[in-house]
Amino acid sequence: HNTTVFQGVAGQSLQVSCPYDSMKHWGRRKAWCRQLGEKGPCQRVVSTHNLWLLSFLRRWNGSTAITDDTLGGTLTITLRNLQPHDAGLYQCQSLHGSEADTLRKVLVEVLADPLDHRDAGDLWFPGESESFEDAHVEHSISRSLLEGEIPFPPTS
């Protein structure tokens, strides 16, 4: 499994999408786990609803939410109020019994907020081809999401 990089801004929301074959994984619950070291175990963060038919319902664990479009075959994880300690390697998983298949390895990169001027030695002014609005695009991707950018992430 190769890795997909998602980059987000500290203090904002990051949406991660893991596409999968909806037929192959029909009836299976999904999970989001954090990889502990390169060869260590993957520690469960959050999983979809216990009833597979209710997988579309968003489930939270702390600041992390999961929801599954079982027909479209897209697992979506939202990391709210992203912090530097959220950076690292994760997995989207498909569960069957006590086993878990890796759908996708995900590397979360956290970057400084361009509008937060508390970082010493980091003077910043918008360049000619970027605006403050551009700097606050929510970092998200899925089959359909890249058509139009979301100018401001939801604060929920």
Partner: antibody, heavy 118, light 107 residues
Framework: GVQLQQSGPELVKPGASVKMSCKAS????????IHWVNQKPGQGLEWIGY????????NYNEKFKGKATLTSDKSSSTAYMELSSLTSEDSAVYYC???????????WGQGTTLTVSS | DIQMTQSSSSFSVSLGDRVTITCKAS??????LAWYQQKPGNAPRLLIS???SLETGVPSRFNGSGSGKDYTLSITSLQTEDVATYYC?????????FGGGTKLEIK
């Protein structure tokens, strides 16, 4: 405006190491990832890896692990790439580039030409 | 690694022509695709990211389309300044990979 200024051309002997720099200006250095890409004469582009200046996290193309080492210095808004155990195969133009929030590389340095020859 | 294949390494074109450059990924890259233009002696320039989003300052005659494994860069009416080499790049899966390039030459 945004600029990535790379260090000048390098002529080095086989077996030696070289460290090239990429100085960023016109934007907040810790808000964007810096990538390194090489291009051999008359050939295409190849991704070497990136550094996240905010976390100092790196991600390498497996092919360049052990060959390239990426670092950054927040105080001077500069990214560095060190290449070791150089051979003539490493002769190329090396670019640094910033990835935008849509992930494409929106600003590039002018390139550093590395020539490895005895 | 994901292979990016640009079917033509070079194209002979006339000014004013509509030009279509194709790029095929070895697996689905879910629209995580960028197009670059490079002129001799210069660094590449980002034209399109997210398969379809035109970068600021890029003329509207450039258009990106496609999904899944197959992507296209179109130039509606070729201008002199468009003569260059064009590269596609996927950033769905590490290592991020580029196509071999398509060089446009005037007939």
């Amino acid at each position: 405006g945004v600029q990535l200024q790379q260090s000048g051309p390098e002529l080095v002997k086989p077996g030696a190491s070289v460290k090239m720099s990429c100085k960023a200006s016109g934007y907040k250095f810790t808000s964007y990832i810096i990538h390194w890409v090489n291009q051999k004469p008359g050939q295409g582009l190849e991704w070497i890896g990136y550094i996240n200046p905010y976390s100092d996290g790196t991600n390498y193309n497996e092919k360049f692990k052990g060959k390239a080492t990426l670092t950054s210095d927040k105080s001077s808004s500069t990214a560095y790439m060190e290449l070791s155990s150089l051979t003539s195969e490493d002769s190329a133009v090396y670019y640094c580039a910033r990835s935008s929030y849509r992930y494409g590389f929106d600003y590039w340095g002018q390139g550093t030409t590395l020539t490895v020859s005895s | 690694d994901i292979q990016m294949t640009q079917s033509s390494s070079s194209f002979s074109v006339s000014l004013g022509d509509r030009v279509t450059i194709t790029c095929k990924a070895s697996e689905d890259i879910y629209n995580r695709l960028a197009w670059y233009q490079q002129k001799p002696g210069n660094a590449p320039r980002l034209l399109i990211s997210g398969a379809t989003s035109l970068e600021t300052g890029v003329p509207s005659r450039f258009n990106g389309s496609g999904s899944g494994k197959d992507y296209t860069l179109s130039i509606t009416s070729l201008q002199t300044e468009d003569v260059a080499t064009y590269y596609c790049q996927q950033y769905w899966s590490t290592p991020w990979t580029f196509g071999g390039g398509t060089k446009l030459e005037i007939k």
